[in-house]
Interface confidence: low
């Protein structure tokens, strides 16, 4: 369930994990004519302390990584997010059926890390 | 608890909110001379379908919100992480007990969005 | 045994300036960091501003209008008062803290500065 999604106990850390997205499944087929779909992937893990170096933590993630461990009701653990992002070329139709090329940013996750 | 921490009936929208840390609660007063500490802030919240503009979403997460939407146990939410960062500027001992000011980047929330 | 003596307080209308001193004496190794702090009546000690050798940090509600620097041949540090508000007015006082140590060792006796609208 969703709910069982969160306990920590079944995460590992934060990482990349691949991802397809059909733009089918996404019912966007009727006005994206190309590319069907594409790896979009996502970020998910733990950002437990100590973070290490591969998780890409900022400086404010470790602090508020060490103010979690002292108030975990209170102040949440920082968040698995992607910190590179790529963008995707998509053919589609307009309102007005005109076909239209055009370079989405923020589409493809390259990196994940803590935040 | 921490795990009813992140059940999604107890949060609301992701939002940026307030939190002053206190470097001597971190252990960090030995070495930092000044500031005593500051606001450094926190992003937490639900990021939920549908996501609105001040979620500051990116495109990567309007799709993975619809993804979630379809595989609630394989694909979580996008999550709220920080979108604007400011530096702050630390006077500390090194080392060799020289005094330092040094400008650390990414260390206050000032905005929260959907990742 | 290290003294701390601040001088320089006083009254002054709103918009004014004073420039306050705080002149270390005794043992002292490695005069390190001093500080600013202010305690008005019925409040909390608040941080003013931080002098050493690599530089000054300001509290935010100080920031742009004090202005603190230091004499190291005199052992002293300064604190610069510009556009004073009401607001500032309170007991200032000035700490030292010494390579290693975990805190502000000395304290000065203070120093009285009120500021009139």
């Known amino acids: 369930s969703a709910s069982d999604y969160n306990s920590s106990e079944l995460k590992t850390a934060c990482r990349k994990h691949e991802l397809y997205v059909s733009f089918q499944d996404l019912g966007w087929q009727d006005w994206i004519i190309a590319p069907k779909g594409y790896a979009a992937n996502y970020c998910d893990g733990e950002c437990s302390f100590p973070l290490n170096a591969h998780m890409n933590a900022t400086n404010h993630a470790i602090v508020q990584t060490l103010v979690h461990l002292m108030n975990p009701e209170y102040v949440p653990k920082p968040c698995c997010a992607p910190t590179k992002l790529n963008a995707i070329s998509v053919l589609y139709f307009d309102d007005n059926s005109n076909v239209i090329l055009k370079k989405y940013r923020n589409m493809v996750v390259r990196a994940c890390g803590c935040h | 608890s921490a795990s009813d921490y992140n059940s999604s009936e107890l949060k609301t929208a992701c939002r940026k909110h307030e939190l002053y840390v206190s470097f001597q609660d971190l252990g960090w007063q030995d070495w930092i001379i000044a500031p005593k500490g500051y606001a450094a802030n926190y992003c937490d919240g639900e990021c939920s379908f549908p996501l609105n503009a001040h979620m500051n979403a990116t495109n990567h997460a309007i799709v993975q919100t619809l993804v979630h939407l379809m595989n609630p146990e394989y694909v979580p939410k996008p999550c709220c992480a920080p979108t604007k960062l400011n530096a702050i500027s630390v006077l500390y001992f090194d080392d060799n007990s020289n005094v330092i000011l040094k400008k650390y980047r990414n260390m206050v929330v000032r905005a929260c969005g959907c990742h | 045994e290290v003294q701390l003596v601040e001088s320089g307080g006083g009254l002054v209308q709103a918009g004014g300036s004073l420039r306050l001193s705080c002149a270390a004496s005794g043992s002292i190794r490695g005069f390190v960091a001093m500080a600013w702090y202010r305690q008005a009546p019925g409040k909390q000690r608040e941080w003013v501003a931080t002098?050493?050798?690599?530089?000054?940090l300001y509290g935010d509600s100080v920031k742009g209008r004090f202005t603190g620097s230091r004499d190291n041949a005199k052992n002293t540090v300064y604190l610069q008062m510009n556009s004073l508000k009401p607001e500032d007015t309170a007991v200032y006082y000035c700490?030292?803290?010494?390579?290693?140590?975990?805190?502000?060792?000395?304290w000065g006796q203070g120093t009285q500065v009120t500021v009139s609208s």
């Open positions: 700490a030292l803290r010494q390579i290693g140590a975990s805190g502000y060792d000395y």
């Open positions: 002098v050493t050798n690599g530089g000054t």
